[in-house]
């Protein structure tokens, strides 16, 4: 359109100059840009009442580059486009859409979710955790000797964070109530920290029973267990054996 | 004369990470975008997905989007395409390429990936 | 995706006869007039040429012995008379819809 009425003003004003400025291949006086050199944009530019033609070397925001083999000009985005390749093409939409396979979409079709961050329909992402850690070693109060009834944890990492719409992280922490053999801390060994220590193995028979969290238990002076007689005690470890309670931070 | 020079070869372990450079010269670097194209081996060719130098917006063909990131380095008129998580079907030749009014008349030499254990 | 089909996989054609290549779109890839496809030529060891842009117009510098046809879904690639440098694989390629696609070639060897 814009280029049949270039072409027609061409032929109609008899002041054609081969002396242009700016890109332009023809021009006129008065009309400006009649023709422009290879790679560059045809586009009219109101000035005025007056329209003159000029040659850009890319196309204005809104506008995408046409090809044809006599002039090559600058169409319009669709309204709801602000930058495209083409109509069906485009690379970001207007405030208010989402962009998703080149259409701009009031809302993201299902199974996608909007990041109001890109403007665009994404895929939903699931949380994804690690495998568990090893226990750690079976502590209280930080030290691995000198009572019966301590904790260990473990934790795991979290690989991938899930989007809005994706699936919550589960625990990533996790503790349970463990038995030691109880023996006496040696010269020195006093408050030395679990990670310091090598494990012990609990002895045949002993069990390890999950609890909420350390702090519940380091609360209480004293666990009411280590004051039944070894009868009650078996009694009490087949019932709580695998209990296995977590706690974590929701992510 | 517009020329898009491309980095040279590349030989990389499974997992790794690696990124390839195109270097345009004899126009305007922020005038057109550039795309990037996968061809496997005398096969075919595959979009991976666009970046405007001038402002940095990129998109991406939905089956490249995880793993592919189209970056520019407008002060040295350069794009690049990285791509993570190698596996071996990634083993292709890659083209960077100018898109002008819906095609690409411009194009790299190609850089060829290897991905080998 | 729009899925571009072509055929023939391979042809062989004497010199100075004509090859023609077809190129299938599973869907329309016009839009407001134009058609948004393109002809490309590609020889071993180097990046492909466009030779055809928006489905009839010759690149500059392409011998007019190629030419393309066609419009909505039906594409054609003709070459006439054959050279012995047009040896290559043919790729058709559509830009109207994302994700851009390309067709999967057709080789053109001369008998």
């Known amino acids: 359109q814009n280029a049949s009425r270039g072409r027609r003003q061409r032929r109609m004003h008899p002041n054609v100059s081969q002396g242009c400025q700016g890109g332009c291949a023809t021009c006129s006086d008065y009309n400006g840009c009649l023709s422009c050199k290879p790679r560059l944009f045809f586009a009219l530019e109101r000035i005025g009442m007056k329209q003159i033609g000029v040659c850009l070397s890319s196309c204005p925001s809104g506008y995408y580059g046409t090809r044809y083999p006599d002039i090559n000009k600058c169409t319009k985005c669709k309204a709801d486009c602000d930058t495209c390749f083409n109509k069906n093409f485009c690379t970001k939409c207007k405030s208010g859409f989402y962009l998703h396979l080149g259409k701009c979409l009031d809302n993201c079709p299902e199974g996608l979710e909007a990041n109001n961050h890109t403007m665009e329909c994404v895929s939903i992402v699931h949380c994804e955790v690690s495998e568990w850690n090893p226990w750690s070693p079976c502590t209280k109060k930080g030290k691995t000797c000198g009572f019966k009834r301590g904790t260990e944890t473990r934790v795991r990492e979290i690989i991938q964070h899930p989007s809005a719409k994706g699936n919550l992280c589960p625990p990533t922490n996790e503790t349970r109530k463990c038995t030691v053999q109880r023996k006496k801390c040696q010269k020195g060994e006093r408050g030395k920290k679990g990670r310091e220590r090598k494990r012990k193995k609990p002895n045949k028979g002993e069990s390890k029973e999950a609890i909420p969290d350390s702090k519940s238990l380091e609360s209480s002076k004293e666990i009411p267990e280590q004051r039944e007689n070894k009868q009650q005690q078996k009694k009490r470890k087949v019932q709580d054996k695998q209990k296995s309670v977590s706690v974590s931070t929701v992510h | 004369q517009v020329q898009l020079k491309q980095s040279g070869p590349e030989l990389v372990k499974p997992g790794a990470s690696v990124k390839i450079s195109c270097k345009a010269s004899g126009y305007t670097f922020t005038d057109y975008s550039i795309h990037w194209v996968k061809q496997n081996h005398g096969k075919s060719l595959d979009w991976i997905g666009y970046?405007?130098?001038?402002?940095?917006?990129?998109g991406y063909n939905q089956k490249f989007k995880n793993r592919a990131t189209l970056t520019v380095d407008t002060s040295y008129s350069t794009a690049y395409l990285e791509v993570r998580r190698l596996t071996f079907e990634d083993s292709a030749v890659y083209y960077c390429?100018?898109?002008?009014?819906?095609?690409?008349?411009?194009w790299g030499q190609g850089t060829t990936l290897t991905v080998s254990s | 995706d729009i899925v571009l089909t072509q055929s023939p996989a391979s042809l062989a054609v004497s010199l100075g006869q004509r090859a023609t290549i077809s190129c299938k779109a599973s869907?329309?890839?016009?839009?407001?007039?134009?058609?948004?496809m393109n002809w490309y030529q590609q020889k071993p060891g180097q990046p492909p040429k466009l030779l055809i842009y928006a489905a009839s117009n010759l690149e500059s510098g392409i011998p007019a012995r190629f030419s393309g046809s066609g419009s909505g879904t039906d594409f054609t690639l003709n070459i006439h008379p054959v050279e012995e440098e047009d040896a290559a694989t043919y790729y058709c390629?559509?830009?109207?819809?994302?994700?851009?696609?390309f067709g999967a070639g057709t080789k053109l060897e001369l008998k």
């Open positions: 869907q329309s890839v016009d839009y407001d007039g134009d058609s948004y």
């Open positions: 390429a100018t898109y002008f009014a819906n095609n690409f008349d411009y």
């Open positions: 390629q559509q830009s109207n819809e994302d994700p851009l696609t």
């Open positions: 970046i405007y130098p001038s402002n940095g917006d990129s």
